[in-house]
Structure formats: structure tokens, C-alpha cells
Interface confidence: medium
């Protein structure tokens, strides 16, 4: 599923991401835009043999199990395929664990490079939340 901007903002808010660990909803929507272009089925392969999955591009080396990433930790205790569902519950729950890990949203390279320090509220402007 490819979410609309406001549709995703509403879904993320319903799942409790607004101000989760101090990160406003706009940060999460911005991260999703530049990680996956709002596409829940996005997959991207990394040079270390791992793969990033879903709307927030969660990595198989650390967070989920795709059955083929050497030394996978699977810290979210889920199959990576669950992160590709049109229901973003699994991605949100795992993202909450990631953002609580110490580096905050710096764990997402796209957030660090494209969202951090910008007017992230623009990503939810005009949305009925």
C-alpha cells in the first residue's frame, strides 16, 4: 500500500507515534517519505547483505528476521515480511523499540539527512488529525 501523506499521519497518530520519545508526528511522516516514499512494500538491499523493509525501512541485521541475514539479532522479534503489511502496526511497534534504543531517530539515515533540523511540521500541515 502507498499511503497518502495525511492518511499516514493519521495512522501513525492512531498508533501513538505523535511525540513518542519526544519526536513529533511530522518527524515520523518525514522519515517515512524519504525512507520509502510512503510505500509499505518497499524493500532495499544493503552492501552488508542485510535488507531494509517497509514504510520505515527497518533493517534485517538488527530488528527483524528475513531468514537470510547472517548474524541477525531480530530485536523486534518479527519476520521482516510483517513489516510489509498495509497495516503499519508491526512497523510502528518495531520503530518504537528502535527509537528507544539510544540514538533516537538518528537510527534512520534518511531522517538524519533529510528531516532533522527542518520544518517537519510541514509534513502534517493541512491534515485533519
Amino acid at each position: 500500500k502507498v499511503f497518502g501523506r495525511c492518511e499516514l499521519a493519521a495512522a501513525m497518530k492512531r498508533h501513538g507515534l505523535d511525540n513518542y520519545r519526544g519526536y513529533s508526528l511530522g518527524n515520523w511522516v518525514c522519515a517515512a517519505k524519504f525512507e520509502s516514499n510512503f510505500n509499505t512494500q518497499a524493500t532495499n538491499r544493503n552492501t552488508d547483505g542485510s535488507t531494509d523493509y517497509g514504510i520505515l525501512q527497518i533493517n534485517s541485521r538488527w530488528w527483524c528476521n528475513d531468514g537470510r541475514t547472517p548474524g541477525s539479532r531480530n530485536l523486534c522479534n518479527i519476520p521482516c515480511s510483517a513489516l510489509l503489511s498495509s497495516d503499519i502496526t508491526a512497523s510502528v511497534n518495531c520503530a518504537k523499540k528502535i527509537v528507544s534504543d539510544g540514538n533516537g531517530m538518528n537510527a534512520w539515515v534518511a531522517w538524519r539527512n533529510r528531516c532533522k533540523g527542518t520544518d517537519v511540521q510541514a509534513w502534517i500541515r493541512g491534515c485533519r488529525l
Partner: antibody
Framework: QVQLQESGAEVMKPGASVKISCKAT????????IEWVKQRPGHGLEWIGE????????YYNEKFKGKATFTADTSSNTAYMQLSSLTSEDSAVYYC?????????WGQGTTLTVSS | DIELTQSPATLSVTPGDSVSLSCRAS??????LHWYQQKSHESPRLLIK???QRASGIPSRFSGSGSGTDFTLSINSVETEDFGMYFC?????????FGGGTKLEIK
């Protein structure tokens, strides 16, 4: 136990298309990548690409882009590979395998012969 | 693409001999190297994963070693059922690639 059952041998004419199937049993089909491998005598094993059945995400070896197309039907736990514009170079045995990085589980292979 | 070069192309041995098969990668692949045996008209069978881990049900006479670019599959006291083709495969990056194979034949 995990099993991959491929469709039977095919004899096709040059220019035609063929669709090979791979039915998976014994594990959660949507969770693992299905990989496709080509074997020709004297050419060893070649990785064609992969599909994640749960999402339909696909990756292709550049060499096979435009030649192979992967699909999957999660209701029947079956992955498919279509090969188009067949030539004699496509005559080979085609395997599906479960993608665990390594390939512990293989189909029995589908022999494709392209001949006029 | 990562190229895998296997040597020798053919190895002629007598049952009871011990042999070593080599697989060399064109760049470092850590331990992401796997070995397969294939007999005529059969699918490949996984022997060794991640350079040195024997797959389930594989006899202890098969062992693997190596890391980086140089890998070895060893067969201690070859049995008649071991004759066939042996392939290595890397899973360090895409596209996945295989070696050209070593044929183990009876002398």
C-alpha cells in the same frame, strides 16, 4: 518438512514464453524469499533473481532483466517465473530454492528445451 | 559482481583418499560462502554454510574453512557416494554468484 515442487519439463519454440511454477509446503511461504537459479551444461549455476511472496517485492540479476518475471500466489503457496522471447540460450534446468542466504531447500528442477 | 573461482576443475581420486577443494573470491566476502554437492540429474545439496558450518545431516567427513577470499572444502576419506560436482556460492552481496564447480571423479 519443507518441500519445493516444480512444474514438469517444457519444450517450447523460439520466441515463445513459458511459465514455470514452484509450489512450497512445510513453512510460512510469505516469510521467505524464493530464489530462481539457472543451470546449463558447461555454464554452471546462475542466480536469476528472487521474490518475497508476502509483498511481491522482486530483485533481478541485471543479466536476466527483461527475460524473467517473477510472481507469487499466496493463496496456493506457489511462486512463478515467466521467461519470454525464448531462444536456444534459454534451454536449461531451472531451479527454485528457498532464500536463506544459502540454499538448503531446492525444487527438483524444471527442464526447458527451446527448439524449432 | 563477485567472481568465484574453483580449483581444480577436475579431481581424480581413489575412495579412501582425503581431498581439498578450493574456492577463491574476487573480493572479500567474510564467511558468507556456502558449499554444495550435485550428482547427475539431481538438485544441488547444501553441505557447508557460512564457510565452516556443516548443514543438517551432512557426514562429519565434510568440513569447510576459510574467510575473506580463500575457502576450502575438505573431504576426509572419500566414499564412493561423494563423487559428483561441487559448487561454492557467495551470499555477501547481490547478485548471488556461484563458482564454476569442481568435478570429483573416481581415478
Amino acid at each position: 518438512q519443507v518441500q519445493l515442487q516444480e512444474s514438469g519439463a517444457e519444450v517450447m519454440k523460439p520466441g515463445a514464453s513459458v511459465k514455470i511454477s514452484c509450489k512450497a509446503t512445510g513453512y510460512t511461504f510469505t516469510t521467505y524469499w524464493i530464489e530462481w537459479v539457472k543451470q546449463r551444461p558447461g555454464h554452471g549455476l546462475e542466480w536469476i533473481g528472487e521474490i518475497l511472496p508476502g509483498s511481491g517485492s522482486t530483485y533481478y540479476n541485471e543479466k536476466f532483466k527483461g527475460k524473467a518475471t517473477f510472481t507469487a500466489d499466496t493463496s496456493s503457496n506457489t511462486a512463478y517465473m515467466q521467461l519470454s522471447s525464448l531462444t536456444s540460450e534459454d534451454s536449461a534446468v531451472y531451479y527454485c530454492a528457498r532464500g536463506d542466504g544459502y540454499y538448503c531447500y531446492w525444487g527438483q528442477g524444471t527442464t526447458l528445451t527451446v527448439s524449432s | 559482481d563477485i567472481e568465484l573461482t574453483q580449483s581444480p576443475a577436475t579431481l581424480s581420486v581413489t575412495p579412501g583418499d582425503s581431498v581439498s577443494l578450493s574456492c577463491r573470491a574476487s573480493q572479500s566476502i567474510s564467511n558468507n560462502l556456502h558449499w554444495y554437492q550435485q550428482k547427475s540429474h539431481e538438485s544441488p545439496r547444501l553441505l557447508i554454510k557460512y564457510a565452516s558450518q556443516r548443514a543438517s545431516g551432512i557426514p562429519s567427513r565434510f568440513s569447510g574453512s576459510g574467510s575473506g577470499t580463500d575457502f576450502t572444502l575438505s573431504i576426509n576419506s572419500v566414499e564412493t557416494e561423494d563423487f559428483g560436482m561441487y559448487f561454492c556460492q557467495q551470499s555477501n552481496s547481490w547478485p548471488r554468484t556461484f563458482g564454476g564447480g569442481t568435478k570429483l571423479e573416481i581415478k
